[in-house]
Interface confidence: medium
């Protein structure tokens, strides 16, 4: 038994049989191929409050601090995935590492990544039903980066 | 004919046939899934240079501005990755958005992106021979940010 | 075994400030990505989200209450606090405090039973 | 601001009907949450990830939708699912939980 991807899964179910509906082997294997954050998540270097550290990972010691949540979804792939989060509204000082600077913004990096969640094949039903791959774009934040605010025209 | 994921290629080959080694179409269907750069690429807009705008896409409105460059593999998937390249060693000035400060370094993000790679099967010859994906790790640069440097204990 | 369970005044007066404090057990608010939010809904109405905490202390706030509002928490003593200053008859609500999943990317996995504030001159 | 649009707002149906409560959100969201809860009580986590039913939720209940329109679907109504259903997302930037005016669900 091996993973089959669909684009559209609905229409053109390639599938995979699975037993009374629990994941395969191959399902389990792949999916678990969780994308882990850029930065190593640290304990001793999390982001506390709005403030720029001179040590540690790379989204605490940024002006604009970030810290990573975790979304886990055990039907898809990946199953984890990790959002950032921004720590201030504003960029913080590079002189001082804790006062904001009203000049700039930080804000979140989003981009749409592909990901492939499990569905039941369409029309399939029972205790040997199958399930089949659907590509969907997910939109996540990446990481959080100190802007020039827009000037509107 | 469907697109089989296999863990470990080489030693459990989970393949399908192609014609003539073209790749078969769900494969062109599937890997053409490329990954667009988070921000679109303006031609407008492309930061190009060390500064930072007040208008425009956030690479190029960033104090750390950068560039996104194309990374094209047609037996990858995605076959299209983008690398954001630092266009300055140090933060723009968010006052004049030209100078830059040495208080601050201009450093990419980097990602150990999941991706997988179209292989010919273990043992597998001749015209008809059979294919695979194998899975990998592949080291993107995701963006840059405007960092404190770091301080040696 | 997680609870949460929340404490106020009950009745207040108008222009007062409103202090509730949400207890609870069966988890640790210094965990990675552990958050509590307070939520409220008036009588016979929906639900409204107000604030939400973080283990790393980050704050936010809905913006239509953020000049009035403010989180905190005691992370040694399990406990989460919300403060609403110049309360009037719009702020008559039951308030819930509610924990989102380390890994249940924006939902609220346990809710505490409900505090019921009526403010009355 | 994201909102979110519940159908109807108070429905009924008779026992083993099946029935179907839609969520539509004015931007578009990576996932729906929803959420029952009947009088004086508080919510309960009842569909989270679109699709996945939280614990102790009968294998009747289904969530489903992507984008802008979502819906939660009851297979065969029995009396015990009579309540107020809630859907509700979440933005990162700006930073909002958002919750739908909620669908009243009563037996017929």
């Known amino acids: 038994v091996s993973l089959r991807i669909q684009e559209g899964c609905s229409h053109l179910p390639s599938c995979c049989p699975s037993k009374e509906q629990e994941p395969p082997e191959e399902w389990l294997k792949w999916s678990s191929a969780s994308v882990s954050p850029p930065e190593p998540l640290s304990h001793t270097h999390h982001a506390e409050s709005c403030r720029a550290s001179k040590d540690g990972p790379l989204n605490s010691r940024a002006i604009s601090p970030w810290s990573y949540e975790l979304d886990r979804d055990l039907n898809r792939v990946p199953q984890d995935l990790y959002h950032a989060r921004c720590l201030c509204p504003h960029c913080v000082s590079l002189q001082t590492g804790s006062h904001m600077d009203p000049l700039g913004n930080s804000v979140p990096l989003y981009h749409n990544q592909t990901v492939f969640y499990r569905r039941p094949c369409h029309g399939e039903e029972g205790t040997h039903r199958r399930y089949c791959l659907e590509r969907r774009l997910y939109r996540v934040s990446l990481a959080c980066v100190c802007v020039r605010p827009r000037v509107m025209a | 004919v469907s697109l089989r994921i296999q863990e470990g290629c080489s030693h459990l080959p989970s393949c399908c046939p192609s014609k003539e080694q073209e790749p078969p179409e769900e494969w062109l269907k599937w890997s053409s899934a490329s990954v667009s750069p988070p921000e679109p690429l303006s031609h407008t807009h492309h930061a190009e240079s060390c500064r930072a705008s007040k208008d425009g896409p956030l690479n190029s409105r960033a104090i750390s501005p950068w560039s996104y460059e194309l990374d094209r593999d047609l037996n990858r998937v995605p076959q299209d990755l983008y690398h954001a390249r630092c266009l300055c060693p140090h933060c723009v000035s968010l006052q004049t958005g030209s100078h830059m400060d040495p208080l601050g370094n201009s450093v990419p993000l980097y990602h150990n992106q999941t991706v997988f790679y179209r292989r010919p099967c273990h043992g597998e010859e001749g015209t008809h021979r059979r294919y695979c994906l194998e899975r990998r790790l592949y080291r993107v640069s995701l963006a840059c940010v405007c960092v404190r440097p770091r301080v040696m204990a | 075994q997680v609870t949460l369970k929340e404490s106020g005044p009950g009745i207040l007066q108008p222009s007062q400030t409103l202090s509730l404090t949400c207890s609870f057990s069966?988890?640790?608010?210094?965990?990675?990505?552990?958050?509590v939010s307070w939520i409220r809904q008036p009588s016979g109405k929906g639900l409204e989200w107000l604030a939400h905490i973080y283990w790393d202390d980050a704050k936010f706030y809905n913006p239509s209450l953020k000049s009035r509002v403010t989180i905190s928490k005691d992370t040694s003593r399990n406990q989460v606090f919300l403060r609403i200053t110049s309360v009037d008859t719009a702020d008559i609500a039951t308030y819930y405090c509610a924990r989102r999943g380390y890994d249940n990317y924006g939902g609220f996995v346990d809710w505490g039973q409900g505090t019921l504030v009526t403010v009355s001159s | 601001e994201n909102v979110l649009i519940q159908s109807p707002a108070i429905m009924s149906a008779s026992l083993g009907e099946k029935v179907t409560m839609s969520c539509r959100a004015s931007s578009s969201v990576n996932y729906m949450y929803w959420y029952q809860q009947k009088s004086d009580a508080p919510p309960k986590l009842w569909i989270y990830?679109?699709?996945n039913l939280a614990p102790g939720v009968p294998g009747r209940f289904s969530g489903s939708g992507s984008g802008n329109s979502y819906s939660l679907t009851i297979s065969s109504m029995e009396g015990e699912d009579a309540a107020t259903y809630y859907c509700?997302?979440?933005?990162?930037?700006?930073?909002?939980?958002?919750f739908g005016g909620g669908t009243k669900l009563e037996i017929k």
């Open positions: 509700q997302q979440f933005t990162s930037y700006p930073y909002m939980y958002t």
């Open positions: 990830y679109t699709s």
């Open positions: 069966g988890f640790s608010l210094s965990t990675s990505g552990m958050g």
